[in-house]
């Protein structure tokens, strides 16, 4: 996702993105909440393709690990949180059935707020 | 992206998520910046699967369309911005070559800041 810094902008939450292989992932959670094994390769018409996922999560080394940047601290507590999305992947379930399923992957780092009580 | 409301939380930016078909998308931008046609169906071992994408974008009807929630307005200008990620999809390029390519899809709504000058 585009880097806001190039426009003289800052993100409220610092994130880090990377390409993750199925070998790195090994398992994932599918849409029914079950744990499935992510297969390393996908058969295509002329051979096989490695399964890759583009993942984004909150940067544990970033400035915003203690809270979000730019928040009105008088009124709000804040936290940067990794959010997820679904992508289709070739997987194997606990009964050894192979199939295409939607799995959850990390896709962003967003800021969540809770109101400060009793100031 | 999990709903923060269940924990009494608010998002700094309001988002909306939906399942998008290849028929809805029609085209997408691939990793080299070229426009490709997204094919409606993917051949699998015993038939075909519709290509679906789980997309998240900033909610144009949301409270945060004028700026992010909870920002310290004395010091910052803010904007909710849809960010993108890459997912693999079966596509056809301008030369009618069909293949699996990583395409950009909307995956999140994040807050970006610019510092207020000359207060």
């Amino acid at each position: 996702h585009s880097d806001p810094a190039r426009r003289g902008e800052l993100s409220v939450c610092d994130s880090i993105s990377e390409w993750v292989t199925a070998a790195d992932k090994k398992t994932a959670v599918d849409m029914s909440g079950g744990t499935v094994t992510v297969l390393e390769k996908v058969p295509v018409s002329k051979g096989q393709l490695k399964q890759y996922f583009y993942e984004t999560k909150c940067n544990p080394m970033g400035y915003t690990k203690e809270g979000c940047r730019g928040i009105d601290k008088r009124h709000w507590n804040s936290q940067c949180r990794t959010t997820q999305s679904y992508v289709r992947a070739l997987t194997m379930d606990s009964k050894k059935r192979i199939g295409w399923r939607f799995i959850r992957i990390d896709t962003s780092c967003v800021c969540t707020l809770t109101i400060k009580r009793g100031r | 992206h999990s709903d923060p409301a269940r924990r009494g939380e608010l998002s700094v930016c309001d988002s909306i998520s939906e399942w998008v078909t290849a028929a809805d998308k029609k085209t997408a931008v691939d990793m080299s910046g070229g426009t490709v046609t997204v094919l409606e169906k993917v051949p699998v071992s015993k038939g075909q699967l519709k290509q679906y994408f789980y997309e998240t974008k900033c909610n144009p009807m949301g409270y945060t369309k004028e700026g992010c929630r909870g920002i310290d307005k004395r010091h910052w200008n803010s904007q909710c911005r849809t960010t993108q990620s890459y997912v693999r999809a079966l596509t056809m390029d301008s030369k009618k070559r069909i293949g699996w390519r990583f395409i950009r899809i909307d995956t999140s709504c994040v807050c970006t800041l610019t510092i207020k000058r000359g207060r």
């Epitope: 849409m31 029914s32 909440g33 959010t83 997820q84 999305s85 679904y86 009964k95 059935r97 199939g99 939607f102 959850r104 | 992206h1 999990s2 709903d3 269940r6 998520s17 939906e18 399942w19 015993k46 038939g47 075909q48 699967l49 519709k50 679906y52 789980y54 997309e55 998240t56």
Partner: antibody, heavy 115, light 108 residues
Framework: DVQLVESGGGVVRPGESLRLSCTAS????????MTWVRQPPGKGLELVSH???????YYADSVKGRITVSRDNSNGTLYLQMNSLRVEDTAVYYC?????????WGLGILVTVSS | EIVLTQSPGTLSLSPGERATLTCRAS??????LAWYQQKPGQAPRLLIY???RRATGIPDRFSGSGSGTDFTLTINRLEPEDFAVYYC??????????FGGGTKVEIK
Amino acid sequence: DVQLVESGGGVVRPGESLRLSCTASGFDFSRYGMTWVRQPPGKGLELVSHIVDLGGAYYADSVKGRITVSRDNSNGTLYLQMNSLRVEDTAVYYCARGNTFFEYWGLGILVTVSS
Amino acid sequence: EIVLTQSPGTLSLSPGERATLTCRASQSVGSDLAWYQQKPGQAPRLLIYDSSRRATGIPDRFSGSGSGTDFTLTINRLEPEDFAVYYCQQYYDWPPLTFGGGTKVEIK
């Protein structure tokens, strides 16, 4: 015990709106996909809309653009906002728990669209 | 979308007999198929999922079989409470999941 209770049905005229609710109890609502299925009088079952745990919505072609599904995880409620209703939307509307198959269903609520 | 065709439309049997209901998919759905029972004025009730797995609390006289495009729901020794409408549903090509048109099992 898992319970799903629909409300908000009734009789409306074509073109009008209605908002159905489904109140869930007995499970962690936020962890489950939820689905609206309808059944016109004397007919079979038809998927209307679906919302996954992460909040993403799917709509059947027959209702796309007229219906909005949403969920409030804080109070365990699923909603179906139906606009520009048509006579062919007349049905019993069920909410069901799940993404793929449905172990738990509400009792259903009747929506009648008639001039 | 995947079309499910159920047959027969109506099955007339006596209590104690065996009922065999079929569901055919327009393309392979693997084993991602469920069966439901619906009685008049009631919500559907899940009987079988993943083609052959019985849902919680379902008696063992109900069994499911098949994979790919052809599926069968068998009810051994029909009980009076088994007379109802039965629907199959696929969740292989999701979304959208689709239902069959139903088979009515009636008392002969």
